[in-house]
């Protein structure tokens, strides 16, 4: 399973799924343009499964208020896209297995290299 490769525009919703991972425990994001959101390079956790059944989302991350689980676990997520979200989303399993989704957000390569806001939460019209 090569994983997903999804295209979308700011303001659209995309579904991220955890294909081939038996017990998903967390999602990790490696941004293509980290500086666009004022971040450093590398992977960062964006969501964990929790025993309460409600996934844990770190408070200081770019997807707060835009990412939600579509099922009782964290196998399927819905993300409301924003400029700068381009990157690779990894679904990590309990047994070290993982799946990946490569996301390309329309205009990111241009928008994220332009001077201006680094948070990327509002897409210029």
């Amino acid at each position: 399973n090569p994983g997903a490769s999804l295209d979308g525009r700011p303001g659209d919703r995309v579904n991220l799924s955890c294909g081939g991972v038996s017990h998903p425990i967390r999602w990790v994001w490696a941004p293509s343009f980290p500086a666009c959101k004022g971040l450093s390079k590398g992977r960062r956790p964006i969501l964990w499964a929790s025993s309460s059944g409600t996934p844990t989302v770190p408070p200081l991350q770019p997807f707060v208020g835009r990412l939600r689980s579509l099922d009782s676990g964290i196998r399927r997520l819905e993300l409301l896209l924003s400029a700068g979200d381009s990157g690779t989303f990894f679904c990590k399993g309990r047994h070290e297995d993982e799946s990946r989704t490569v996301l390309h957000v329309l205009g990111d390569r241009t928008y994220c290299k332009a001077p201006g806001p680094t948070h990327g939460s509002v897409y210029p019209q």
Epitope: G3, G8, R9, S17, H104, G107
Partner: antibody
């Protein structure tokens, strides 16, 4: 009204290159992905690739890598497909089309451009 | 690459019939499945996107369903203007791929 107007039919010699154009009206290509699709005579549809016109970010089916080049000119609201080193296998109708992304399919298509490779 | 298979390459039905065209993906495509209609003159139109959402202007007699690897397009009340070839396409991963098509004719 959304329209994609493609250039006219081409008759080209083996080994040559051809550049097809697709001019959009009714929308700004910078706000969509532009795709190119190939259809050989009496065959199905083959996805060649797509471009994000705002940043010239192109992706291709590996079998068309090096054979096809997709470009865009946002000032003229147009996209282009160049096919090089033409052989009889490249004889086909080529469609340009637009998409808002993976969730939405390819929602509007051009009328197609027929390319015939013959000596 | 993900292979998309339309096992029926052609079918014939009567006006007013309910027709179902099926499509199978070589792996789970998470509902990123679209259907297109190509008329005999070559014109291509999107009918349904994301498995079951009707594109604007498409008659409600067209519907789509499915999940995982198996998907279908249904025409509930066949009309003469539905004579065409129908293609499925996955948008789950690059390269996007199409099924081989199902040619629909009127008996």
């Amino acid at each position: 009204e959304v329209q994609l107007q493609q250039s006219g039919a081409e008759l080209v010699k083996p080994g040559a290159s051809v550049k097809l154009s697709c001019t959009a009206s009714g929308f700004n290509i910078k706000e969509t992905y532009i795709h190119w699709v190939k259809q050989r005579p009496e065959q199905g549809l083959e996805w060649i690739g797509r471009i994000d016109p705002a940043d010239v970010y192109g992706r291709y089916d590996p079998k068309f890598q090096g054979k096809a080049t997709i470009t865009a000119d946002t000032s003229s609201n147009s996209a282009y497909l160049q096919v090089s080193s033409l052989t009889s296998e490249d004889t086909a109708v080529y469609y340009c089309a637009r998409s808002y992304g993976s969730s939405y399919g390819i929602d509007y298509w051009g009328q197609g451009t027929s390319v015939t490779v013959s000596s | 690459d993900i292979q998309m298979t339309q096992t029926t390459s052609s079918l014939s039905a009567s006006l007013g019939d309910r027709v179902t065209i099926s499509c199978r993906a070589s792996q789970d495509i998470s509902n990123y499945l679209n259907w297109y209609q190509q008329k005999p003159d070559g014109t291509v139109k999107l009918l349904i996107y994301y498995t079951s959402t009707l594109h604007s202007g498409v008659p409600s007699r067209f519907s789509g369903s499915g999940s995982g690897t198996d998907y279908s397009l249904t025409i509930s009340n066949l009309e003469q203007e539905d004579v065409a070839t129908y293609f499925c396409q996955q948008g789950y991963t690059l390269p996007w791929t199409f099924g081989g098509g199902t040619k629909l004719e009127i008996k």
